[in-house]
């Protein structure tokens, strides 16, 4: 079973950004993260990015204010990945 | 200016095939999911299918499962639809349109007659 | 799955406000959480006039607004204008069958 993040959360939230900050898995078998942004209601990310396994920020930027979104973040290894940790903001 | 141009439409027999092409200019092609909508002559529209930036995530209408693929290559700003075993029904005008929140930019579409 | 029912057709004189509506309906009770609405004249590719219910795109004139109250939502356009005259549809997602849909569409028609 592919390691879940459990500590994602949000900080600097603004009307068109939001951080995200969770605590790197200690796994040498990770291979990095994927973010996804999908507007609360709606089918496929807007906006999807991959990040390294060391890093444990992200900023989301050229969000919209007034629209909730559900911000996850995947953990990637060789051939699997993780179940989605995610969170709900609007901005 | 931000541009979507649809192509490869023409006449098939049933059965046939087709490979739709979206040529993408005016904007970053790879930071955003892609759709294909078709509309019927004389009818209203039809969602056929959708790819995210990275194409980690596709999904299909019930209508078109198993016989359509979409497909494309952020290299080349192109979106793809490739139409296997056609029919009839699949006579449309075929558009692809940009995902944001909503579909906020259309191509002009392509016409796809599929007639023996 | 969901689908959604507009109203086949309706009109208004020149000024006035129309209201399109767009009810979610679904075998297993579920709904829809956000709608947009599009425009398309005859001929034309649809253009995106409302999302995520209530946004306008900009360009779009504040006559159009969207609502939405349980499983309906609604297109209004005040002040009707000639160049108004189109079909409209409106388009969610279904999260349970994983899917985009649309309406089946309004012809809306500017008398006069």
């Known amino acids: 079973e592919v390691p879940q993040l459990t500590d994602l959360s949000f900080v600097d939230i603004t009307d068109s950004s939001i951080g995200l900050r969770w605590t790197p898995l200690n796994s040498s078998t990770i291979i990095g993260y994927r973010i996804t942004v999908v507007a609360a209601g709606e089918g496929i990310p807007i906006f999807e990015d991959f990040v390294d396994s060391s890093v444990g920020y992200y900023t989301v930027t050229g969000l919209e204010p007034g629209i909730d979104y559900d911000i996850s973040v995947i953990t990637l290894i060789n051939g699997g990945e993780s179940a989605p940790t995610t969170l709900t903001q609007q901005t | 200016q931000v541009q979507l141009v649809e192509s490869g439409g023409g006449l098939v027999q049933p059965g046939g095939s087709l490979r739709l092409s979206c040529a993408a200019s005016g904007f970053t092609f790879s930071s955003y999911g892609m759709h294909w909508v078709r509309q019927a002559p004389g009818k209203g529209l039809e969602w056929v299918s959708v790819i995210s930036s990275s194409g980690s995530y596709i999904y299909y209408a019930d209508s078109v499962k198993g016989r359509f693929t979409i497909s494309r290559d952020n290299s080349k700003n192109t979106l793809y639809l490739q139409m296997n075993s056609l029919r009839a029904e699949d006579t449309a005008v075929y558009y692809c349109?940009?995902?944001?929140?909503?579909?906020?930019?259309w191509g002009q579409g392509t016409l796809v007659t599929v007639s023996s | 799955d969901i689908a959604l029912t507009q109203p086949a057709s309706v009109s208004g004189s020149p000024g006035q406000s129309i209201t399109i509506s767009c009810t979610g309906t679904?075998?297993?009770?579920?709904?829809?959480?956000?709608v947009s609405w599009y425009q398309q004249h005859p001929g034309k590719a649809p253009k995106l006039m409302i999302y995520?219910?209530?946004k306008r795109p900009s360009g779009v004139s504040n006559r159009f607004s969207g609502s939405k109250s349980g499983n309906t939502a609604s297109l209004t356009i005040s002040g009707l204008q000639a160049e108004d005259e189109a079909d409209y549809y409106c388009q969610a997602w279904d999260n349970q069958g994983m899917k985009y849909v649309f309406g089946g569409g309004t012809k809306l028609t500017v008398l006069g």
């Open positions: 995520y219910v209530h």
């Open positions: 349109a940009r995902n944001k929140v909503g579909f906020d930019v």
């Open positions: 679904s075998s297993d009770g579920g709904g829809y959480n956000t």
